[in-house]
């Protein structure tokens, strides 16, 4: 038996932040559960991860140098990330591992979120217009 | 005027507890995320620990993950430290210090520390 | 995790003269770098965060500037409450980490 996850397909990462919601077909209500997120299409980055142990705070921390929090929901966790960079726009596939009570599960690999950072754009002064549209 | 004043420190033995505590005041606590900060001669300043508005998430620094645990009581305007088998290398002055929830590392206020020594 | 390296260690100077702080990032840290002046006995204070803003409160000859991995505080005019330890401090990836510090001492 595998959990089902949903993801949004795209998210917009503006000024450098995103919150990413990762919805489980499975109760996270007194388990304990190993959340995380990771980079890439072969999921190669991990990029955060959420450790839930009865219901208790909640531990994150990330091996890979991103800076992340975590909420938890009964049937979700949601990621927020930041300080993204443009060139971490990529494919975030949420994981989900519910290690007690018995038996262990893991999810079926989800369709991902591709989030795209969009980077500042400094508005142009008054007095020093940009270039006219036509 | 905001303040953070850190109690709790003292001289444990290697192996031994400690439990410091954060009390805040002139600023909405449950607002911020509260930090711990260490500082020794040899290393500096190190990052800690820190919780988030709620208490409902923390990280750890690698090296004292599995043995410290930080919580905070939002209605007593209060921050802790569980230090758990205590190393010689925790040894340092410890601070308190918050940051925004929305700029998440930025040490704005620091408390004026409180001496942790581990030793035999 | 990214290692902040100040230089130089100690900076010997006269009240009223300029002082030039360093810190570089051993991998860009884009603007997200702040600066601490701390005081023997005391706590770090903020001075700079995201590079070049001023935290509340502090004078104006205080500046900071720099991007990516090169980074500088400038006291443009040494007062004698200046002379203190300067640390740099990043948060662009976690966790956080700080410099070693600058002493800016009285020649």
């Known amino acids: 038996n595998k959990i089902l996850v949903k993801q949004s397909p795209m998210l917009v990462a503006y000024d450098n932040a995103v919150n990413l919601s990762c919805k489980y077909s499975y109760n996270l209500f007194s388990r304990e559960f190993r959340a995380s997120l990771h980079k890439g299409l072969d999921s190669a980055v991990e990029v955060c991860v959420v450790y839930g142990n009865y219901s208790q705070q909640l531990q994150v921390y990330s091996k890979t140098g991103f800076n992340c929090d975590g909420k938890l929901g009964n049937e979700s966790v949601t990621f927020y990330l930041q300080n993204l960079y443009v060139n971490q726009t990529d494919i975030y596939f949420c994981k989900i591992e519910v290690m007690y009570p018995p038996p262990y599960l893991d999810n079926e690999k989800s369709n991902g979120t591709i989030i795209h950072v969009k980077g500042k754009h400094l508005c142009p002064s008054p007095l020093f217009p940009g270039p006219s549209k036509p | 005027e905001v303040q953070l004043v850190e109690s709790g420190g003292g001289l444990v033995q290697p192996g031994g507890s400690l439990r410091l505590s954060c009390a805040a005041s002139?600023?909405?606590?449950?607002?911020?995320?509260i930090h711990w900060v260490r500082q020794t001669p040899g290393k500096g300043l190190v990052w800690v620990s820190r919780?988030?508005?709620?208490?409902?998430?923390?990280s750890h620094a690698d090296s004292v993950r599995g043995r410290f645990t930080i919580s905070r009581h939002n209605a007593k305007n209060t921050l802790y430290l569980q230090m758990n088998s205590l190393r010689a290398e925790d040894t340092a002055v410890y601070y308190c210090?918050?940051?925004?929830?929305?700029?998440?590392?930025?040490?704005?206020?620091w408390g004026q520390g409180t001496l942790v020594t581990v030793s035999s | 995790e990214i290692v902040l390296t100040q230089s130089p260690a100690t900076l010997s100077l006269s009240p009223g003269e300029r002082a030039t702080l360093s810190c570089r990032a051993s991998?860009?840290?884009?603007?997200?770098l702040a600066w601490y002046q701390q005081k023997p006995g005391q706590a770090p204070r903020l001075l700079i965060y995201?590079?070049?803003n001023r935290a509340t409160g502090i004078p104006a000859r205080f500046s900071g500037s720099g991007s990516g991995t090169d980074f500088t505080l400038t006291i443009s005019s040494l007062e004698p409450e200046d002379f203190a330890v300067y640390y740099c401090?990043?948060?662009?990836?976690?966790?956080?980490?700080f410099g070693q510090g600058t002493k800016v001492e009285i020649k």
């Open positions: 210090t918050r940051s925004d929830s929305s700029t998440w590392y930025k040490f704005d206020y």
């Open positions: 002139g600023f909405t606590f449950s607002s911020y995320w």
């Open positions: 919780i988030n508005s709620d208490g409902s998430s923390a």
């Open positions: 991998q860009s840290v884009s603007s997200y």
């Open positions: 995201d590079a070049s």
């Open positions: 401090q990043q948060r662009s990836n976690w966790p956080p980490t």
